[in-house]
């Protein structure tokens, strides 16, 4: 599936995301993880997802954003973190979304 550009795994029970996902799917542009059970993001989580233009993370249980998880997403146009448990609008420790 190395040519895959869109992956929809919404409405599942994914609680951990392996960073190797995007290394195995280098062409991935759209990743839909809505309605899963993710609780934390780190700067490793999407480190290899450098071509993402859309990342849908709504309706998870994300309470913690450690370090700078979106710093490598230079092409990101849409990021949806609605309906999570975030207590701050700070998406990490530095400005990441240009």
């Amino acid at each position: 599936y190395s040519q895959l550009t869109s992956l929809d795994v919404g409405f599942n029970t994914i609680s951990k995301l392996e960073p190797e996902l995007c290394q195995k799917l280098p062409m991935l542009k759209v990743l839909n993880l809505q309605h899963n059970e993710l609780s934390q993001l780190s700067d490793k989580t999407f480190a290899f997802c450098t071509n993402l233009t859309e990342l849908h993370l709504m309706s998870n249980s994300i309470q913690k954003i450690k370090n700078n998880p979106f710093v490598k997403q230079k092409n990101l146009i849409t990021l949806d973190l609605s309906h999570n448990g975030l207590s701050s609008t700070k998406l990490g420790t530095q400005v990441q979304l240009e």
């Epitope: 960073p19 480190a47 450690k66």
Partner: antibody, heavy 117, light 107 residues
Framework: EVQLQQYGAELGKPGTSVKLSCKVS????????MHWVNQRPGKGLEWIGR????????IYGEKFKNKATLTADTSSNTAYMQLSQLKSDDTAIYFC??????????WGQGVMVTVSS | DIQMTQSPASLSASLGETVSIECLAS??????LAWYQQKSGKSPQVLIY???RLEDGVPSRFSGSGSGTRYSLKISGMQPEDEADYFC?????????FGSGTKLEIK
């Protein structure tokens, strides 16, 4: 299956150094952080520090800043910790552990370091 | 550094009994708390992360709860294999710090 392999036991003389290794199989260490934790005989756990194998960035506990040096080799998927200027109170079990979120979901079996003249 | 005060230091429980271990942080750690089990002569194993999330493969009799500065680990129905040391650990701020441990024995 993820495994963290630590080998043997180390005997060091006061003032010398030892270098411990932790070889990871079943997982690419660039995807995570490698941590080191010690446990003195009959005591609790103490965090030493962590390394990001992807770039070599390290963070140390204050107590270990001049004691431990963490390195990693992504080509062999191995993390290392060098302990310098050994003293008797460095005698402990030293564990390597993996954790993307600073809790540790995989541990090595630990290496006993004994410092004695 | 954030201090983690764990209690009790030791505990005896009968098989089938429900057991609780407490951990008090010196400041709010915002649920960045894990619990570990360490059997004699072995390395620790994570039971709970993010205060209440059960690690894959851990029996459902283990549960974690709490918020702010106060957290607890509950074992609902003590089993022989639960005899071990238990540690809490905060990952909210560096340095990562551990509680001093609870030794759980079978009565």
């Amino acid at each position: 299956e993820v495994q963290l392999q630590q080998y043997g036991a180390e005997l060091g003389k006061p003032g010398t150094s030892v270098k411990l290794s932790c070889k990871v199989s079943g997982y690419n260490i660039t995807y995570t952080y490698m941590h080191w934790v010690n446990q003195r005989p009959g005591k609790g756990l103490e965090w030493i520090g962590r390394i990001d194998p992807a770039n070599g960035n390290t963070i140390y506990g204050e107590k270990f800043k001049n004691k431990a040096t963490l390195t990693a080799d992504t080509s062999s998927n191995t993390a290392y910790m060098q302990l310098s200027q050994l003293k008797s109170d460095d005698t402990a079990i030293y564990f390597c552990a993996m954790g993307e979120f600073d809790y540790f979901d995989h541990w090595g079996q630990g290496v006993m370091v004994t410092v004695s003249s | 550094d954030i201090q983690m005060t764990q209690s009790p230091a030791s505990l005896s429980a009968s098989l089938g009994e429900t057991v609780s271990i407490e951990c008090l942080a010196s400041e709010d750690i915002s649920n960045d708390l894990a619990w570990y089990q360490q059997k004699s002569g072995k390395s620790p194993q994570v039971l709970i992360y993010a205060a209440s999330r059960l690690e894959d493969g851990v029996p459902s009799r283990f549960s974690g709860s709490g918020s702010g500065t106060r957290y607890s680990l509950k074992i609902s129905g003590m089993q022989p294999e639960d005899e071990a040391d238990y540690f809490c650990q905060q990952s909210y701020k560096y340095p990562v710090t551990f509680g001093s441990g609870t030794k759980l024995e079978i009565k």
